[in-house]
Interface confidence: low
């Protein structure tokens, strides 16, 4: 349904508040270094223009595409060349190349200062003084740090952010009320950002087919009572929504997501019995709720899969007639029967099935050739099961912090060329799989753990892509989306790595370490641990443990000293010498 003016269409569909918020998110995700005030000015100009188009869709420039309008606006920024360097060259291009160019310059790890949380009273005063600016600033700060954050979901976060301040700024103990809510929003926000980043990577690096396969598997697990045709329709619509958001088309994305939520709720009887509560909520909450809804119960008496996909004489005929539809049906049928499998495992099984049919349907006796295809699935299923069992045992034995340390050593030895901050961040997140998933019963562990690990390893992949330093990381990240985790698991110690030169500066600490939070202290310790492994990749666990214990004790001692800085200087030299001796450096 073509509209004379796309900008007027979206403004009317979304309303002024959502329109302005989404344009701000879009601009902040593209120009991540621009000051808040500059973005607000641009957004206000776009909004005023949109209003003229609502009043008269035939007015000048109202027929232009959103990419043209937004790109033209971004290219008016005076400091584009100084601030962004070669990104300014995008402005010499025409659409759609210009937008593609902007997308390629999105930075997953922008050089921005860490967000420091002000005192509660300061935040409450700012909230009361100008609520609109306060919330816009939240959108801006999150969007520029997370350039692929799912925009309609960020509106939901902003709504919860506002609700937290509205409630807590009038509470007797503001801090006790507000801080846990802000912590929860921060942690959920990071998780949401990482999950969306994987969706965008799937679409951008592996194509629409890969994303659709993922969506078929996940939606079939979630809605096992829905017909294949219904799941296919949802997958098509969901793919459109995420393609738009990942492509920077945030107004279309938010609009289409609202339409999809509306469709799901209008057809919930043929989709899932679990949607009732979600569908009674307002729009933003409704969409979020649907995205997180629990799996429906499996229909009773589902027939064996073998009948249609192994025993039938029409397997090759059905496959040849419409390969992707037939494989989609296989994936749907397998996934709805297996909520206990990770999505990536289901996709590995579908890939194995596809490879077998490709080979066997060209053979002299196809049926004989593919008759045992399900036997090939057994090792694929057992590998993640065993891995999760072993790692959950280790997690239960060590606790989260020590488990993270074990992973830090493991991953630093696998890919020592990767930057220390990236290794620390990724290993800490990998280690969180224990707290997140090991508490679940067996039937829920694998989907929780392996699909979470896919999200975390994607963080490693996107950070590494910005500055590639390891062929092994590149290989695991690019060869197969669904085999990333097994690829990293299979990596052994990198024997080609030349140990890093010992640099005493790396292990020089100052009194500022004494005022850090528990989490920041852990990160300091873990950073030192990674550096130790980079210096001495063949160090035994015992050697590393011993040196790290002394290091931690040294910091403890100096933080209790009267003259902390002198203690750090003098004792630090002794520590470095002792560590070098202990590790044979």
């Amino acid at each position: 349904d073509a509209h004379k003016s796309e900008v007027a269409h979206r403004f009317k569909d979304l309303g002024e508040e959502n329109f302005k918020a989404l344009v701000l998110i879009a601009f902040a995700q593209y120009l991540q270094q621009c000051p808040f005030e500059d973005h607000v000015k641009l957004v206000n100009e776009v909004t005023e223009f949109a209003k003229t188009c609502v009043a008269d869709e035939s007015a000048e420039n109202c027929d232009k595409s959103l990419h043209t309008l937004f790109g033209d606006k971004l290219c008016t920024v005076a400091t584009l060349r100084e601030t962004y360097g070669e990104m300014a060259d995008c402005c010499a291009k025409q659409e759609p190349e210009r937008n593609e160019c902007f997308l390629q310059h999105k930075d997953d790890n922008p050089n921005l200062p860490r967000l420091v949380r002000p005192e509660v009273d300061v935040m409450c005063t700012a909230f009361h003084d100008n609520e609109e600016t306060f919330l816009k600033k939240y959108l801006y700060e999150i969007a520029r740090r997370h350039p692929y954050f799912y925009a309609p979901e960020l509106l939901f976060f902003a709504k919860r952010y506002k609700a937290a301040f509205t409630e807590c700024c009038q509470a007797a103990d503001k801090a006790a009320c507000l801080l846990p809510k802000l912590d929860e929003l921060r942690d959920e926000g990071k998780a949401s950002s990482a999950k969306q980043r994987l969706k965008c990577a799937s679409l951008q690096k592996f194509g629409e087919r890969a994303f659709k396969a993922w969506a078929v598997a996940r939606l079939s697990q979630r809605f096992p009572k829905a017909e294949f045709a219904e799941v296919s329709k949802l997958v098509t619509d969901l793919t459109k929504v995420h393609t738009e958001c990942c492509h920077g088309d945030l107004l279309e994305c938010a609009d289409d997501r609202a339409d999809l939520a509306k469709y799901i709720c209008e057809n919930q009887d043929s989709i899932s019995s679990k949607l009732k509560e979600c569908c009674e909520k307002p729009l933003l909450e409704k969409s979020h709720c649907i995205a997180e809804v629990e799996n429906d119960e499996m229909p009773a008496d589902l027939p064996s899969l073998a009948a249609d996909f192994v025993e039938s004489k029409d397997v090759c005929k059905n496959y040849a007639e419409a390969k992707d539809v037939f494989l989609g049906m296989f994936l749907y049928e397998y996934a709805r029967r297996h909520p206990d499998y990770s999505v990536v495992l289901l996709l590995r099984l579908a890939k194995t099935y596809e490879t077998t049919l490709e080979k066997c349907c060209a053979a002299a006796d196809p049926h004989e050739c593919y008759a045992k295809v399900f036997d090939e699935f057994k090792p694929l299923v057992e590998e993640p099961q065993n891995l999760i069992k072993q790692n959950c045992e280790l997690f239960e034995q060590l606790g989260e912090y020590k488990f993270q340390n074990a992973l830090l050593v493991r991953y630093t030895k696998k890919v020592p060329q990767v930057s220390t901050p990236t290794l620390v961040e990724v290993s800490r997140n990998l280690g969180k799989v224990g707290s997140k998933c090991c508490k679940h019963p067996e039937a829920k562990r694998m989907p929780c753990a392996e699909d979470y690990l896919s999200v975390v390893l994607n963080q490693l992949c996107v950070l590494h892509e910005k500055t590639p330093v390891s062929d092994r990381v590149t290989k695991c990240c690019t060869e197969s989306l669904v085999n990333r985790r097994p690829c990293f698991s299979a990596l052994e110690v990198d024997e080609t790595y030349v140990p890093k030169e010992f640099n005493a500066e790396t292990f020089t600490f100052h009194a500022d370490i004494c005022t850090l939070s528990e989490k920041e202290r852990q990160i300091k310790k873990q950073t030192a641990l990674v550096e130790l492994v980079k210096h001495k990749p063949k160090a035994t666990k015992e050697q590393l443990k011993a040196v790290m214990d002394d290091f931690a004790a040294f910091v403890e001692k100096c933080c209790k000293a009267d003259d902390k800085e002198t203690c750090f200087a003098e004792e630090g030299k002794k520590l470095v010498a002792a560590s070098q001796a202990a590790l044979g450096l």
Epitope: C514, R521, K541, E542, K545, D549, D550, A553, F554, C559
Partner: nanobody
């Protein structure tokens, strides 16, 4: 797994001395931070003294500083607590604890080592009774 066995407890008059020993087996003793803790009747277990893997970092609770000395002999897989000038308030069951330093029982930052080491001990002995009478 590491097994810890304490010995050397007993009854003594105020002002007297005792030397507690803690023998470890089943692990790489030299890589563990070790600590002594005590629990008086009706009270929580409290940190007394701790020593890092190499013996280069040592800590004491304020109430025993100058009276107690912790040491370790990695060749013998043993940690010691020499207790002099004992007081009736030192009466308690004394436990030996080992903290796996891969988990870095000695935490970073301004909080005293006892809070962290006590909470993060991976292994404990059965305890030895010390009674100081006036």
């Amino acid at each position: 797994d590491v097994q810890l066995v304490e010995s050397g407890g007993g009854s003594v008059q105020a002002g007297g001395s005792l030397r507690l020993s803690c023998a470890a087996s089943g692990g790489t003793f030299s890589s563990y931070a070790m600590g002594w803790y005590r629990q008086a009747p009706g009270k929580e277990r409290e940190f007394v003294s701790g020593i890092s893997w190499s013996g280069s970092s040592i800590d004491y609770v304020d109430s025993v500083k100058g009276r107690f000395t912790i040491s370790r002999d990695n060749a013998k897989n043993t940690v010691y607590l020499q207790m002099n000038s004992l007081k009736p308030e030192d009466t308690a069951v004394y436990y030996c604890g080992a903290a796996d330093p891969m988990g870095l029982g000695y935490g970073l930052g301004p909080r005293p080592v006892d809070r962290l080491l006590s909470a993060e001990c991976d292994y404990w002995g059965q305890g030895t009774q010390v009674t100081v009478s006036s």
